[in-house]
């Protein structure tokens, strides 16, 4: 009486249940009446991650220097490489496939959160009280400087993007 | 938890029929899928695979064995059974039931086992 | 039949020691070896299956690898426990059959 469904890690056919080949391995030949599956190994710079009956392996990834991409995790025979940006760079999607110069924050602007090698920059404006002269990927919003500690009075008001000018006091006439 | 016993004579005399049954708990032979598997270990030597039963009663034996082999199943009981006939003293082992959830292994769950001596 | 040789067929360490016991099969049997372990008097126990997948509940200090004839049986970090007889069974064809063991011993 043939079967008419498989367990775990086998699959139907030729009304037998044959073993899928394990991670790492591709399909050689179906199992028959009297010998199991023939599987083989991936070869290199190849994988198959699941147990299977895949008659070929899957190429790993390629990490193209030229897109601004780096090896972050280096394939093996089960599993595919992983790639990231280059420093100062982050990929332009979850898959990493290209990659994009992390976004400076312009003037006015400071940094909230530096970029990763998989998110870009996040900029906040400049509160009232703090400063941003420069394009930056890593500045933060500046405070500015309290003349009171210095024992200066405010000669030019501070904006979002410079700082305070402090002077002397007035000497009484 | 799946539990495997055999049961049967410990003393079998030369040239008679040894017989063994495994009672299976705590899954069903007529569910499907699994193979039930006996398998020897003789004194001092290694473990030799006697043959396996399908719950549709599909066998594989081991050509290799001398005396001739019967597996049978009772779906109804729970059980499945082995008979070498014209046992001889090279057949004293220590008999196991096993389960294996392929046609070709691995056993996943064994029986404690049971000691059968040929005696002449 | 395919045979299984398995060497050594006898080895002593101590608790802690890695260990590898290797089995050459006399052909190709793709990645279906299974690994057992036996104590005296007990039924063996399933460690290894399909060369290299852990059987559930198996602790991860044995591990298995190879492919095609050559089979390695590693346990990184020897207990008290792991003394036993070990053996490799190919599932590749009929008849199926088992490496002669290899005994762990205390040293």
């Known amino acids: 009486e043939p079967p008419t469904a498989c367990r775990e890690k086998q699959y139907l056919i030729n009304s037998q249940c044959c073993s899928l080949c394990q991670p790492g391995q591709k399909l050689v030949s179906d199992c028959t009446e009297f010998t199991e599956t023939e599987c083989l190994p991936c070869g290199e710079s190849e994988f198959l991650d699941t147990w299977n009956r895949e008659t070929h392996c899957h190429q790993h990834k390629y990490c193209d220097p030229n897109l601004g991409l780096r090896v972050q995790q280096k394939g093996t025979s089960e599993t595919d490489t992983i790639c990231t940006c280059e420093e100062g760079w982050h990929c332009t999607s979850e898959a990493c496939e290209s990659c994009v110069l992390h976004r400076s924050c312009s003037p006015g602007f400071g940094v909230k959160q530096i970029a990763t090698g998989v998110s870009d920059t996040i900029c906040e404006p400049c509160p009232v009280g703090f400063f941003s002269n420069v394009s930056s990927a890593f500045e933060k919003c500046h405070p500015w400087t309290s003349c009171e500690t210095k024992d200066l009075v405010v000669q030019q008001a501070g904006t979002n993007k410079t700082d305070v000018v402090c002077g002397p006091q007035d000497r009484l006439r | 938890e799946v539990h495997l016993v055999e049961s049967g004579p410990g003393l079998v005399k030369a040239s008679q029929t040894l017989s063994l049954t495994c009672t299976v708990s705590?899954?069903?032979?007529?569910?499907?899928?699994?193979?039930w598997t006996w398998i020897r270990h003789h004194p001092g030597r290694g473990l030799e695979w006697i043959g396996h039963i399908s719950y549709s009663g599909r066998t594989s034996y081991n050509p290799s064995l001398k005396s001739p082999i019967t597996i049978s199943v009772d779906t109804s009981k729970n059980q499945f059974s082995l008979r070498l006939s014209s046992v001889t003293a090279a057949d004293t082992a220590l008999y196991f039931c096993?389960?294996?959830?392929?046609?070709?292994?691995?056993?996943?769950?064994w029986g404690q086992g049971s000691l059968v001596t040929v005696s002449s | 039949d395919i045979r299984l040789t398995q060497s050594p067929s006898s080895v002593s360490a101590s608790v802690g020691d890695r260990v590898t016991i290797t089995c050459r099969a006399s052909?190709?049997?793709?990645?279906?070896l299974a690994w057992y372990q036996q104590k005296p008097g007990k039924a063996p126990k399933l460690l290894i299956y399909?060369?290299?997948s852990l059987q559930s509940g198996v602790p991860s200090r044995f591990s298995g690898s190879g492919s095609g004839t050559d089979f390695t049986l590693t346990i990184s970090s020897l207990q008290p426990e792991d003394f036993a007889t070990y053996y490799c069974q190919q599932a590749n064809s009929f008849p199926l059959t088992f490496g002669g063991g290899t005994k762990l011993e205390i040293k």
């Open positions: 705590g899954d069903s032979i007529s569910s499907g899928g699994y193979y």
């Open positions: 399909a060369a290299s």
């Open positions: 052909q190709g049997i793709s990645s279906w």
């Open positions: 096993a389960r294996a959830s392929t046609r070709f292994g691995p056993f996943d769950y």
